[in-house]
């Protein structure tokens, strides 16, 4: 059974994995210009359902593309150290949630980049308020 | 209503220059970025550059790139080419067009203006 | 430099289903455009990201995608449907944007 301990550090996990994503989605929201829209072009690979924190693994698969993006976006830009401290946090974050269980990820549907961080956003939301219920 | 109006266009010698305006109206032509794409008689269409927002970032085809310039004036709600060093194959309808929705897809363009480059 | 494929013309008779196919190695991992072009008109957008169509634009024009070809549909054509189509993507690196070569749709009748 988990302990309070356990759960709290999942809870801190959850709301920095959250807080990683909320700073990348207003990143991307920033460039409302021909960076954004090149960004857009990007897919995104979804999976049927991301109930369960395995279902990090489908996030975890995807960051490599995400990176790809953000740094196209950023280009000689400064911010890169962001995105990248950002990428890494996610991914650190991620590793620790979602468990030694391997978990296949069935992919369902392509999306942008802003649907897939605000889909991940809302799925660290949702765990987050059921967990504190 | 969104609307862009291409000018400038006519019959020029090659080697010569020639600038493009595209005037933008009802839409706030400063939150978008802006394209210009170009279709030779008979031909298929050709994305020549496009530019941000705020003209910070400016992206152009192989085909035109060191001889044309995308530039826009924010206040005066207008996007400018400047065509350098104009060659025969440059001949072509020049459209302007904007990703106004918040998709990469060129939702709105102009009607054209047209560039013959021929001596 | 990248190139999108496409068929240069497509014929089909009134009430047929036609599918304009666009081959482009970057397609697994971008989205493609489709825009419609009538002779001595501005191109129009009718697909993004694939499969979803502006407001305006008929159910009959569908978009998907799989692998390395993005497919136009356009169910029960007519003659109104008789246009040049183009996809529209952006290339590996994601910095540059390219059309197809385009297809010329034939509704025969």
């Known amino acids: 059974a988990p302990t309070s301990s356990s759960t709290k550090e999942t809870q801190e996990q959850l709301d920095q994995l959250l807080l990683d994503l909320q700073v990348l989605l207003k990143g991307v929201n920033d460039y409302k210009n021909s960076k954004l829209s090149r960004m857009l072009t990007f897919k995104f690979y979804m999976p049927k359902k991301v109930t369960e924190l395995k279902h990090l693994q489908c996030l975890e698969e995807e960051l490599k593309p995400l990176e790809e993006v953000l740094n196209l976006a950023q280009g000689k830009n400064s911010h890169g150290g962001n995105t990248r401290e950002s990428i890494s946090n996610i991914n650190v974050t991620v590793l620790k949630l979602k468990g030694s269980e391997t978990f296949m990820c069935e992919y369902d549907e392509t999306v942008t980049i802003v649907e897939f961080l605000n889909r991940w956003i809302t799925f660290c939301q949702s765990i987050i308020s059921a967990s504190s219920s | 209503e969104v609307q862009l109006v291409e000018s400038g266009g006519g019959l020029v010698q090659p080697g010569r220059s020639l600038r493009l305006s595209c005037a933008a109206s009802?839409?706030?032509?400063?939150?978008?970025?802006m394209h210009w794409v170009r279709q030779a008689p008979g031909k298929g269409l050709e994305w020549v550059a496009d530019?941000?927002?705020?003209?910070?970032?400016?992206y152009y085809a192989d085909s035109v790139k060191g001889r044309f310039t995308i530039s826009r004036d924010n206040s005066k709600t207008t996007l400018y080419l400047q065509m350098n060093s104009l060659r025969p194959e440059d001949t072509a309808v020049y459209y302007c067009?904007?990703?106004?929705?918040?998709?990469?897809?060129?939702?709105?363009w102009g009607q054209g203006t047209l560039v013959t480059v021929s001596s | 430099s990248y190139e999108l494929t496409q068929p240069p013309s497509v014929s089909v008779s009134p009430g047929q289903t036609a599918r304009i196919t666009c081959s482009g190695d970057?397609?697994?991992?971008?989205?493609a455009y489709w825009y419609q072009q009538k002779a001595g008109q501005a191109p129009v957008l009718v697909i993004y990201?694939?499969?979803k169509r502006p407001s305006g634009i008929p159910e009959t024009l569908s978009g998907s995608s799989s692998g390395t070809t993005a497919t136009l549909t356009i169910s029960g054509a007519q003659e109104e449907d008789e246009a040049d189509y183009y996809c529209?993507?952006?290339?590996?690196?994601?910095?540059?944007?390219?059309f197809g070569g385009g297809t010329k749709l034939t509704v025969l009748g």
């Open positions: 067009a904007t990703p106004y929705y918040d998709s990469s897809g060129l939702d709105y």
């Open positions: 009802g839409f706030t032509f400063s939150y978008y970025g």
């Open positions: 530019i941000s927002n705020d003209g910070s970032n400016k």
């Open positions: 970057a397609l697994p991992k971008r989205f």
């Open positions: 990201e694939d499969n």
């Open positions: 529209y993507s952006t290339d590996n690196t994601g910095g540059l944007w390219v």
